[in-house]
């Protein structure tokens, strides 16, 4: 199934690719030590080398199934007719500590498998207990998870996972934290981290909400850990704007959800509307996000330390059409410091007894905040009251770049020698390379300096991932993975073209008269051996 290397256009050498003609690709992860690439697909999990040759394929479907069978037919006979059913990979996570891959599918009510990293041998799947089923929803880009390793030598790993539930709130929580046991056959595998008569490590969409808004669901776009918190970027039906009338127009809102890593009772649950605005246009439909560090220059411009987290996000314009959002989209920047501060202010306000909990989809009643002497600091993880808590004001990001024509679909970023480079995938299969610099002349906070084709005409999917050495970017469409070099300096044939490109990777290597990275240029640190500024071209 491996495809032939294919030309990337222009004078660039062909990019390495992997093609899956039969099965749609859904997720991609890269092992941070080995550089090997794991790809989730419909009915398959693939293991590829760093240069995208196929090493292993593991078959996950089709299976004889019916989503009305609960538990699945493999466990208990079912009165509904069975049919050959695709198993869509919806979550793919590397469990480094246990040397295994977690692959969650849509079949059998949404169970997960563990595969050995070396050879994709199936290590086990959970015992069929009610809480082991995550969700039978087939939409691939709607589930997100964060794997939290247990403390070294002791403690248990856990999985925070969010998923749409397609109205089946009695079966599936929308958000939960699950135990990950060392032994894949352990009966407690995927059990809730905590469960008692009153509370457990899960949130369910109340049946009242689904009665009033049958289409209500929460779609999880991106998740990450930052410090002691787990965050999710979600899209959910906006119950304030959407009429309960099923025939009416649906409006969506993007929310950032936060939980404390060590909060098994989910008392720390907070969600805030999130988005950004440019020139009076609101961008409210989150498409993708990427957690990164800012790079020396950007950190200085933002007043951050270099080791603080920032979040690059892509939003489509407006609040309609979740599945086919408008092409107009924006790349935006958030600092985790600002997000945390906004959330803390809201919690503090509520603990002063001000306002309401403001979470209509979850509470189904307007609960007032209760005044309390508890001290609310940056690390506060909630109590049994004043929770769950909703933000009433949208957390606004800084717009960096607006694409009115192509539509941004995916984002990744990294720090190259102190400068922040963002890669944005588009609807037409291109990768835009963007230099973020808030001190740019003319007030443009970002410069799109290059655009390359990964796969013409096919939208770039969300999992845009850098290789461990930051030399390549893996871009995935439904049918192909493409390895795109982060730079193509060699295409620029003169000093002026090289430095005029504004590619932060590129400089003019005087000794060989080629455009290259600094680390590829001999004696680059000697005077007048490596030009990194357009003015130096004239001097040379």
């Amino acid at each position: 199934e491996a495809g032939l290397p294919r030309a990337g256009g222009g004078s660039q050498p062909p990019f390495r690719t992997f093609s899956a003609s039969d099965w749609g690709l859904t997720h991609l992860v890269v092992h941070e030590q080995t550089g090997e690439v794991y790809v989730g697909a419909v009915n398959r999990i693939y293991k590829l080398s760093g240069n995208l040759t196929l090493l292993r394929a593991h078959v996950t479907g089709p299976v004889e199934d019916n989503e009305k069978c609960y538990p699945p037919p493999s466990v208990q006979s079912c009165p509904h007719g069975l049919g050959s059913t695709d198993n869509v990979n919806k979550l793919l996570l590397l469990d480094y500590a246990a040397n295994r891959l977690l692959a969650c599918g849509s079949a059998s009510q949404g169970i997960c498998q563990f595969l050995r990293l070396d050879d994709l041998f199936k290590l086990g799947e959970p015992h069929h207990r009610k809480e082991h089923y995550l969700s039978s929803v087939q939409e691939a880009g709607s589930m997100a998870g964060v794997l939290i390793a247990g403390p070294p030598g002791q403690g248990q790993a856990k999985l925070f996972v969010g998923t749409p539930i397609d109205g089946k709130s009695e079966y599936f929580p929308t958000l939960s934290s699950r135990r990950l046991m060392a032994n894949e056959e352990d009966a407690d595998m995927f059990g809730f981290v905590y469960q008692d008569e009153f509370v457990s490590s899960q949130l369910k969409i109340p049946s009242d909400t689904l009665s009033k808004f049958p289409a209500f669901d929460i779609y999880y776009v991106y998740s990450f850990r930052s410090e002691q918190f787990v965050y999710y970027l979600t899209l959910q039906l906006d119950t304030q704007l959407t009429s309960p009338d099923a025939a009416g127009e649906h409006f969506f809102t993007s929310k950032i959800v936060r939980l404390c890593v060590d909060d098994p009772k989910f008392y720390s649950y907070v969600e805030f509307p999130i988005g950004c605005e440019q020139a009076g246009v609101e961008y409210r439909l989150v498409q993708d996000a990427y957690l990164s560090r800012p790079g020396r220059a950007l950190a200085h411009q933002l007043g951050l330390a270099e080791d603080e987290d920032v979040l690059f996000t892509v939003f489509a314009q407006g609040q309609k059409n979740r599945v086919k959002p408008p092409k107009e989209s924006a790349l935006c920047l958030f600092t985790l410091r600002a997000i945390k501060e906004k959330i803390k202010e809201r919690i503090q306000s509520c603990y002063r007894g001000e306002g309401k909990l403001s979470l209509p989809w979850l509470l189904n009643k307007e609960l007032g905040c209760i005044n309390s002497p508890l001290q609310i600091d940056d690390d506060f993880c909630g109590q049994d009251f004043n929770q769950p808590l909703g933000g009433t004001v949208t957390i606004e990001g800084t717009p960096l770049f607006v694409d009115k024509d192509d539509g941004l679909t995916a984002v990744a970023a990294y720090d190259y020698r102190g400068r922040t480079v963002v890669f944005a995938g588009t609807r037409s299969g291109r990768i835009r390379k963007i230099l973020v610099d808030l001190s740019n002349p003319g007030g443009r906070p970002a410069l799109a300096y290059e655009s390359v084709v990964a796969q013409e005409g096919s939208p770039i999917l969300r999992d845009l991932v850098l290789s461990p050495n930051h030399q390549y970017l893996y871009a995935m469409t439904e049918k192909q993975v493409t390895r795109v070099p982060v730079e193509s300096c060699v295409q620029y044939t003169s000093c002026e073209l090289c430095l005029g490109s504004r590619d932060p990777h590129c400089g003019w290597c005087v000794l060989h008269s080629i455009c290259s990275r600094r680390d590829a240029c001999e004696r680059a640190d000697e005077p007048q051996r490596f030009a990194a500024d357009l003015l130096q071209c004239v001097q040379l």
Epitope: F198, K265, G353, K356, K365, E366, L367, G368, C369, I370, N371, S372, P373, L374, Q375, Q383, D384, F385
Partner: antibody
Amino acid sequence: QVQLQQSGPGLVKPSQTLSLTCAISGDSVSSNSAAWNWIRQSPSRGLEWLGRTYYRSKWYNDYAVSVKSRITINPDTSKNQFSLQLNSVTPEDTAVYYCARDRGYSYGFDYWGQGTLVTVSS
Amino acid sequence: SYELTQPPSVAVSPGQTASITCSGHKLGEKYASWYQQKPGQSPVLVIYQDTKRPSGIPERFSGSNSGNTATLTISGTQAMDEADYYCQAWDSSSVCVFGTGTKVTVL
């Protein structure tokens, strides 16, 4: 199973201090998910919440406005108990006094002590 | 200060439904709990978070809360349900308030 066992005198003279203790078994007074309350009941006032103590990284107290100036609720971690002190009592403070546990504002008082009738009389 | 008002008494025939109301300003914006107390005994929690029953409480006890009124409903009332019933909520300044109490008599 959580149990709360109350102890203390049944008769207190006016202007003196009412002191009661509630011993906890099956839970910890330092639990970060419980609070420990004193509630009283009299024919004239019905059930009346007096206050509570709870630990959330440090100790906190909430008191009813009606008794705020003369009440103290203290935890005793070494004995896993908590106590009520009500100063300057009058016959109006005659009531059955209960200790009770709550697990948060929305969970109600799920365990109660057996109650102690305290009479304030000279 | 915040107040919760209940009817002093409710009479019900065995097997019938008894409804006890509890009124307070915007009570629906708070969580209500309900307690049963029999003579000479400590109160027992029968409903918390408006509608939820602790383990061991029969299904015939149910609760609701909206607007300014919380309601405890005992369906298929039995003789053993004869008792005093109290509603309870916390006000926004973290002070606990009990209702005035309702005596339920099973005829």
